[in-house]
């Protein structure tokens, strides 16, 4: 008795974060024995789409010519071979930006910070939002994700960084999101350049000195120090 068919690989090109109106292609790669590919979208009738494999039959393409709110969400794919359906792929989260106006990102007390000191990045939205997301250019994933509790919406979220080291320097943007869908994000804020100046020896912070991670923001999510100023907001994706 053969074991279960291996799960396929699911990915999106040019990426999984797509601006409204732009095109995106979802790829599902299985095995050479695949006869059909199926794409399911969470909370949508299954299958969301079916495609015949492209030669040499080990993958299929699902095209979205113009990204809209309807396409944002969580996807899984399967393939069918002569012995049946595969296990589901790991999920792909397709996020759309441009759903809301851009928030404003600023640094307190200043975007010019001395190594070893503290800085807080402040993401502000003129309308109430329930999720704020901070990203750093060339980082693999969001640094921090603050979501309000009990549906209480906020106009801002604070992202404290302490102690600051050279790895914190760089270009940041933030997004905001409404409770309608966590797969719908605002336009990105204008970029904020955080400039870290200071000592020649600039060691990365150790976990014993603060709750910042020992690795820098490029390596894993940055944990904030202290409590989130707005009690309605709690941390996610840490």
């Amino acid at each position: 008795q053969a074991g279960p068919l291996p799960k396929p690989t699911l990915w999106a090109e040019p990426g999984s974060v797509i601006s409204w109106g732009n095109s995106v292609t979802i790829w599902c790669q299985g095995t050479l024995e695949a006869r059909e590919y199926r794409l399911d979208k969470e909370e949508s009738p299954a299958p969301w789409d079916r495609q015949n494999p492209l030669e040499p039959k080990n993958k299929a393409r699902f095209s979205i010519p113009s990204m809209t709110e309807d396409y944002a969400g969580r996807y899984r794919c399967y393939y069918r071979s002569p012995v049946g359906w595969s296990q589901p792929s790991d999920p792909l989260e397709l996020v759309m930006t441009g759903a809301y106006s851009k928030p404003t990102l600023s640094a307190l007390p200043s975007p010019l910070v001395t190594s070893g000191k503290s800085v807080t990045l402040l993401c502000q939205s003129r309308s109430p939002m329930d999720t704020f997301l901070l990203i750093k250019e060339r980082a693999a994933h969001p640094l921090l994700h603050l979501r309000s509790e009990h549906g209480a919406q906020q106009h801002q979220a604070e992202f404290p960084m302490s102690p600051v080291t050279s790895v914190h320097g760089g270009t940041y943007r933030c997004f905001s999101s409404h409770g309608f869908s966590h797969y719908l994000l605002s336009h990105p804020s204008d970029p904020l350049e955080l400039i870290v100046s200071g000592s020649l020896e600039d060691p990365r912070p150790s976990p014993t000195r603060s709750v910042s991670t020992a690795a820098g923001p490029e390596d894993q999510p940055l944990m904030p120090t202290g409590s989130v100023p707005h009690s309605g907001l709690r941390r996610h994706w840490e």
Epitope: Q124, R126, S127
Partner: antibody, heavy 120, light 110 residues
Framework: EVQLVESGGGLVQPGGSLRLSCAAS?????????ISWVRQAPGKGLEWIGS?????????YYATWVKGRFTISRDNSKNTLYLQMNSLRAEDTAVYYC???????????WGQGTLVTVSS | DLVMTQSPSTLSASVGDRVTITCQAS??????LAWYQQKPGKPPKLLIY???TLASGVSSRFSGSGSGTEFTLTISSLQPDDVATYYC????????????FGGGTKVEIK
């Protein structure tokens, strides 16, 4: 030239309806702005009616006194914003402005306004 | 509820005088406050944004200050061209607001 131009004002009877338009030129309503409708009754101050977010979802917020009588919408293909006004009353007589919220959160661009008179 | 209270409602001063208008928010609005000048038959004109930043093309006679709940618009030396009504406005947009503007201050020359 970057501008907003309102139209659709005029004389309407109490209980009637009117749709005002706000045509944007020189910038896209689907870029990252909020647009508000503001009115000013003769000899009175500025009164916020409501706002629409230019993001694709198009969230709208209204002043508490609106109570469902007014609706803000947009047509991105025409780069135009609308204010649908129903169950109009004499006290709705005013100059109606549309205005854009800039990156600085202030109303940095205003139309010239259109006069709505509610009278029998 | 977030309410903007502006004072005084009318102000009469002489040419060259220093004139101050205040705006009080019922809760903190950080620095998201703007000031406008409006002349009869015209739309409002943005003077100051983010509490203290002068809008493009506005005379340096105008200045703004404050943060949190207390804000001030100052005209350093009143000129005849400054006769107008001035409004403050907070930058937030949400569904529990009656208005985003203060009640206005009419500035006249003695």
């Amino acid at each position: 030239e970057v501008q907003l131009v309102e139209s659709g004002g005029g004389l309407v009877q109490p209980g009637g309806s009117l749709r005002l338009s706000c045509a944007a030129s020189g910038f896209s309503l689907s870029s990252s702005y909020w647009i508000s409708w503001v009115r000013q009754a003769p000899g009175k101050g500025l009164e916020w009616i409501g706002s629409i977010d230019s993001g694709s979802v198009g969230i709208t917020y209204y002043a508490t006194w609106v109570k469902g009588r007014f609706t803000i919408s947009r047509d991105n293909s025409k780069n135009t914003l609308y204010l649908q006004m129903n169950s109009l009353r004499a006290e709705d007589t005013a100059v109606y402005y549309c205005a854009r919220h800039g990156d600085n959160w202030a109303l940095d661009l205003w139309g010239q306004g259109t006069l709505v008179t509610v009278s029998s | 509820d977030l309410v903007m209270t502006q004072s005084p409602s009318t102000l009469s001063a002489s040419v060259g005088d220093r004139v101050t208008i205040t705006c009080q928010a019922s809760q903190s609005i950080n620095s998201w406050l703007a000031w406008y000048q409006q002349k009869p038959g015209k739309p409002p004109k943005l003077l100051i944004y983010k509490a203290s930043t002068l809008a493009s093309g506005v005379s340096s006679r105008f200045s703004g200050s404050g943060s949190g709940t207390e804000f001030t618009l100052t005209i350093s030396s009143l000129q005849p061209d400054d006769v107008a009504t001035y409004y403050c406005q907070h930058g937030y947009i949400r569904g529990d607001l009656d208005n985003v503007f203060g009640g206005g201050t009419k500035v006249e020359i003695k």
